[in-house]
Interface confidence: low
């Protein structure tokens, strides 16, 4: 095992969750761990530094960001209430609080609202057949190529993840009930000739 | 000082072929991906491919299965050889150091036309 | 291929004025971003790299600034040999892209 820095012809680092290419002076490099950021550049003879996130700023993986993200709380107006706080390595975990229930966009948790009698279950999603009272609710299956990943009553079936429109690749198929999951690709020397 | 030399330009003609070189000194050529761009009359900048230290290739969509980049560590030369010519690919081409393109040579002229 | 918009494309000013020149990366690139400076007939010389750090040997009236998306070449006062073509160039990833460059003139 090669430590960094170090210069490898394919520009595919030994250990590339914990590597990284450094394209300025051509070495691989450390990443920084979980809840630490790059505090000094790697170069040809000294390896990556790195340093604890801030009060209040967070890393979540292995990563080679010139800052931390800042912890947001969990919008109590929004319906949510915190299970996990934010530390520097993971950030806050989120929840409706109880009697609510997701409402979804883009495949994110956007608010919480108050559930109704009728809940969908994941796979599901409601079919209204009064528009205008929104009380007659019948759950109906997620087409092919969609999920739906809540028991909510105003649950909508999303479109799965293409992952390469984010420049990813699939780890894993979407079903019914759970998103594709993307991946970073190779790193781009796993792609030279 | 780095410097980074090309050459093997040239009027060709549709169809046609040329082998350009880029001539390195003032640093480690061995340790060094090598990159190539190029620029068409009037437009701007084009990334052609990289190389990496031991021969490896990267090349833009436009050139695949045309262009082939080579280098001999031992003659500190960088190589593109360029085939099936069109003339969309009239530029100045030039090699840089690195494949962040640090160091860039002066250009040598690829004039493609019948 | 992760795209680069430059802007503006042209810009008129005189020697002694502050010169603002922007790049836009259509997807996060850190601050893996430089600025080049090509006067006709000549190779581009490379002047700012990893966004904000100035290559040895050029006037401190250029700065770079900016991460993730957003970047901007700042000429704090223009020289009669500053007026030339800027382009910027990303190597988040492996392709290299420019933007479409920017030709400073005399006003």
């Known amino acids: 095992q090669l430590v960094p820095p170090y210069r490898i012809e394919n520009q595919t680092c030994w250990d590339q969750d914990k590597e990284y290419y450094e394209p300025m002076h051509d070495v691989c490099c450390s990443r920084c761990p979980p809840g630490e950021f790059v505090f000094a550049v790697c170069s040809r003879s000294q390896d990556t530094v790195c340093k604890t996130c801030p009060h209040n700023s967070y890393n979540e993986h292995w990563n080679h960001l010139s800052t931390c993200q800042l912890c947001r709380p969990c919008d109590i107006v929004l319906g949510f209430e915190e299970v996990a706080p934010c530390t520097s390595d993971r950030k806050a975990e989120c929840r409706c609080q109880p009697g609510m229930s997701c409402v979804y966009l883009d495949n994110e948790c956007v608010h919480c609202e108050e559930e109704r009698l009728v809940l969908c279950q994941p796979g599901t999603e409601a079919e209204v057949t009064d528009e205008i009272m929104d009380t007659d609710v019948n759950c109906v299956p997620c087409k092919p190529g969609h999920f739906q990943n809540t028991s909510s009553p105003r649950a909508r079936c999303q479109p799965h993840t293409r992952c390469e429109i984010q420049g990813l690749v699939e780890a894993a198929p979407g079903t019914s009930y759970s998103d594709t999951i993307c991946k970073n690709p190779p790193e781009p020397g796993a792609m030279l000739l | 000082e780095v410097q980074l030399l090309e050459s093997g330009g040239g009027l060709v003609q549709p169809g046609g072929s040329l082998r350009l070189s880029c001539a390195a000194s003032g640093f480690t050529f061995s340790y060094y991906a090598m990159t190539w761009v190029r620029q068409a009359p009037g437009k701007g900048l084009e990334w052609i491919g990289v190389?990496?230290?031991?021969?490896?290739?990267y090349y833009t969509d436009s050139v695949k299965g045309r262009f082939t980049m080579s280098r001999d560590n031992s003659k500190n030369t960088l190589y593109l050889q360029v085939n099936s010519l069109r003339a969309e690919d009239t530029a100045v081409y030039y090699c840089?150091?690195?494949?962040?393109?640090?160091?860039w040579g002066q250009g040598t002229t690829v004039t493609v036309s019948s | 291929d992760i795209q680069m918009t430059q802007s503006p494309s042209s810009l008129s000013a005189s020697v002694g004025d502050r010169v603002t020149i922007t790049c836009q990366a259509s997807q996060g690139i850190s601050n893996y971003l430089s600025w080049y400076q090509q006067k006709p007939g000549k190779a581009p010389k490379r002047l700012i790299f990893a966004a904000s750090s100035l290559e040895s040997g050029v006037p401190s009236r250029f700065s770079g600034s900016g991460s993730g998306t957003d970047f901007t070449l700042t000429i704090s006062s223009l020289q009669p040999e500053d007026f030339a073509t800027y382009y910027c160039q990303q190597y988040n990833s492996y392709s290299l892209t420019f933007g479409g460059g920017t030709k400073l003139e005399i006003k």
């Open positions: 190389i990496n230290s031991g021969g490896g290739t």
């Open positions: 840089a150091k690195a494949s962040t393109a640090d160091v």
